[in-house]
Interface confidence: medium
């Protein structure tokens, strides 16, 4: 058993049929010694008396809010949550496996630049009685500070018969050093509590591996005289790290016909302009990627040819 | 050339070669995310790799103030990786394919280090840890780790030279 926060405790249980469970001793937080009784949740049934209560925790029915009273007055509470371990593996019932970039990916994180700020998100089909708490650090043995905001519900989607909820959190490294080569990964830890079930999820990454620039901005076409060619120009996204002479991007320019089956013409360039042939009903798209480190491409910025 | 005394390197040449190094490092090990190498007990293998750290003066301001600290750090790293790529980690079994970019990568590391430090000048170099994995699978894993680490190192080096070429070239 360990304390998650004040008056909230997590009991770690091996979860298999007829498991013996864990013996837990609860102590009433009071100077009083006599006349103390214990109850569980909203029940008025007295579970025991005395300053301490010993219970055998085997299943969710044994978890919940234990309260000690004296003469009708509440003295203190202890909330017990369960963390299940099945076949040596901690349960992951609360969050959905996103399977990208690999199986057992519950948390996904992205950064728009090298400033030390990143966003992580996760999915669940649970809509109520759900809380999340997020902590993060750079490195684990001698951790350096990362500040995370509150996890918030950022999207709801219908997937077949199920509703899916996306939660996200924004974090900022306290003393980021954008020009350095990271040697210690960022660690993100999410505590998830659904009713009386506790689970924790972790992700470990370098900022450089989760970089995904915003799409190029101000995408414009300039027709060239007496030609089917156009000059496409664009700019670095506002959110990309500066100076751009140091944090450079590379770009992919694509000409795509109306039909997905039509051949795509692609040009790669380090410049912020390119000359391409604009076919009727086609569109021109540009995306960006870090020039020197192959992290994710941005989403496409697009304009129609006409 | 970045001589220890403090003259300027051939920024544009260094820029071109460092960008080529980035391309080669990624073609040598393109599998991003398919193998989480940090789960494989990193510490004993890549802890000794020289990293370009916050105080090494490789940020735009540091380069403007005095690029020598940063260039020395990059030179150290280039020599380190050049020796690793020439060691039995890469020359031993399982043999690299004849068209593997590792050979080119090795030569380019040497080329850039020589651009930074011509013959007859010596900057301190870092000791290469004695990594001699006994099993071929260990060697393969170590190659991946070294290449992943090299990708991060050459990215920073390439940024330094790109910025230098754009803002510090005579």
């Amino acid at each position: 058993i360990w304390e998650l926060k004040k008056d909230v405790y997590v009991v770690e249980l091996d979860w298999y049929p007829d498991a013996p469970g864990e013996m837990v001793v609860l102590t009433c937080d009071t100077p009083e010694e006599d006349g103390i009784t214990w109850t569980l949740d909203q029940s008025s049934e007295v579970l025991g008396s005395g300053k301490t209560l010993t219970i055998q925790v085997k299943e969710f029915g044994d978890a919940g809010q234990y309260t000690c009273h004296k003469g009708g007055e509440v003295l203190s509470h202890s909330l017990l949550l369960l963390h299940k371990k099945e076949d040596g593996i901690w349960s992951t019932d609360i969050l959905k496996d996103q399977k990208e970039p690999k199986n057992k990916t519950f948390l996904r994180c992205e950064a728009k630049n090298y400033s030390g700020r990143f966003t992580c998100w996760w999915l669940t089909t649970i809509s109520t009685d759900l809380t999340f708490s997020v902590k993060s650090s750079r490195g684990s043995s001698d951790p350096q500070g990362v500040t995370c905001g509150a996890a918030t519900l950022s999207a709801e989607r219908v997937r077949g018969d199920n509703k899916e909820y996306e939660y996200s959190v924004e974090c900022q490294e306290d003393s980021a050093c954008p020009a350095a080569e990271e040697s210690l990964p960022i660690e993100v830890m999410v505590d998830a509590v659904h009713k009386l079930k506790y689970e924790n999820y972790t992700s470990s990454f370098f900022i450089r591996d989760i970089i995904k620039p915003d799409p190029p901005k101000n995408l414009q076409l300039k027709p060239l005289k007496n030609s089917r060619q156009v000059e496409v120009s664009w700019e670095y996204p506002d959110t990309w790290s500066t100076p751009h002479s140091y944090f450079s991007l590379t770009f992919c320019v694509q000409v795509q016909g109306k039909s997905k089956r039509e051949k795509k013409d692609r040009v790669f360039t380090d410049k912020t302009s390119a000359t391409v042939i604009c076919r009727k009903n086609a569109s021109i798209s540009v995306r960006a990627q870090d020039r020197y480190y192959s992290s994710s491409w941005s989403e496409w910025a697009s304009v129609p040819c006409s | 050339r970045a001589v220890p005394g403090g003259s300027s390197p051939a920024w544009t040449q260094c820029q071109q070669l460092s960008q080529k190094l980035c391309t080669l490092a990624w073609s040598a090990h393109p599998l991003v995310g398919h193998m989480d190498l940090r789960e494989e007990g990193d510490e004993e293998t890549t802890n000794d790799v020289p990293h370009i750290q916050c105080g090494d003066g490789c940020d735009p301001q540091g380069l403007r103030d005095n690029s020598q600290f940063c260039l020395q750090r990059i030179h150290q790293g280039l020599i380190f990786y050049e020796k690793l790529l020439g060691s039995d980690i890469f020359t031993g079994e399982p043999s690299l394919l004849p068209d593997s970019p590792v050979g080119q990568l090795h030569a380019s590391l040497l080329g850039l280090s020589q651009l930074l430090q011509p013959e007859g000048h010596h900057w301190e170099t870092q000791q290469i840890p004695s990594l001699s994995p006994s099993q071929p699978w260990q060697r393969l894993l170590l190659r991946f780790k070294i290449l992943r680490s090299l990708q991060a190192f050459v990215a920073v080096a390439a940024r330094v030279f790109a910025h230098g070429a754009a803002t510090l070239s005579p």
């Epitope: 509150a150 974090c171 306290d174 959110t239 100076p243 | -």
Partner: antibody, heavy 122, light 107 residues
């Protein structure tokens, strides 16, 4: 023209509450981190609170933690500061300020509002 | 938390004089330092960021230098319109702390 305009200041009793607003115009508000900075009469500048561009990250000075809440509505281009449990020492001109986006210039406040006066007195 | 200490707290100089204000951080902050000018009854204005980069529109007589813990703001030739209080501010990490200010007057 890039502009920040604060409102909502006034006289309030100790223990009372006040909500300050800062209306932004002339720039893409949703792309910038924003701050509140205050200046007590005849005194220096004191940073109060920061909020990230999306609103997902907030930071507070120790002197206001637990009493003040910073928030923003990007659809209205407005920054807010909810001040509860006000004390006499919170009396100051409250400025809203924009963070410069360029990382190397970090969190220098490049645009300031004209300020709104908050007086806490019985 | 890192403390920022400015000196002097006030100074009086003649028009055309070279004026130097220093700011010391209790721990190293690299070049994450800004200088602001606040004229009497007016709003603070950003002069310098990154310890030495002059904000656009700021007269060239203003310059900044330093890195780590010791920083300097220099006015190469003091003008009557430079009468103001000058603040340094560190921004390597929260809290963004200001120095206590230096009041500059004309003799």
């Amino acid at each position: 023209e890039v502009q920040l305009l604060e409102s909502g200041g006034g006289l309030v009793q100790p223990g009372g509450s006040l909500r300050l607003s800062c209306a932004a115009s002339g720039f893409t508000f949703s792309k910038y981190d924003m701050d509140w900075v205050r200046q007590a009469p005849g005194k220096g500048l004191e940073w109060v609170s920061s909020i990230s561009s999306s609103g997902g990250l907030t930071f507070y000075a120790d002197s206001v933690k637990g009493r003040f809440t910073i928030s923003r509505d990007n659809s209205k281009n407005t920054l807010y500061l909810q001040m509860n449990s006000l004390r006499a020492e919170d009396t100051a001109v409250y400025y809203c300020a924009r963070h410069d986006y360029d990382f190397w210039s970090g969190h220098a406040f490049d645009i300031w509002g004209q300020g709104t006066m908050v007086t806490v007195s019985s | 938390d890192i403390q920022m200490t400015q000196s002097p707290s006030s100074l009086s100089a003649s028009v055309g004089d070279r004026v130097t204000i220093t700011c010391r951080a209790s721990q190293g902050i690299s070049n994450y330092l800004a200088w602001y000018q606040q004229k009497p009854g007016k709003v603070p204005k950003l002069l310098i960021y990154g310890a030495s980069t002059v904000q656009s529109g700021v007269p060239s007589r203003f310059s900044g230098s330093g890195s780590g813990t010791d920083f300097t703001l220099t006015i190469s030739s003091l003008q009557p319109e430079d009468v103001a209080t000058y603040y340094c501010q560190k921004y390597n990490r929260v809290p963004w702390t200001f120095g206590q200010g230096t009041k500059v007057e004309i003799k």
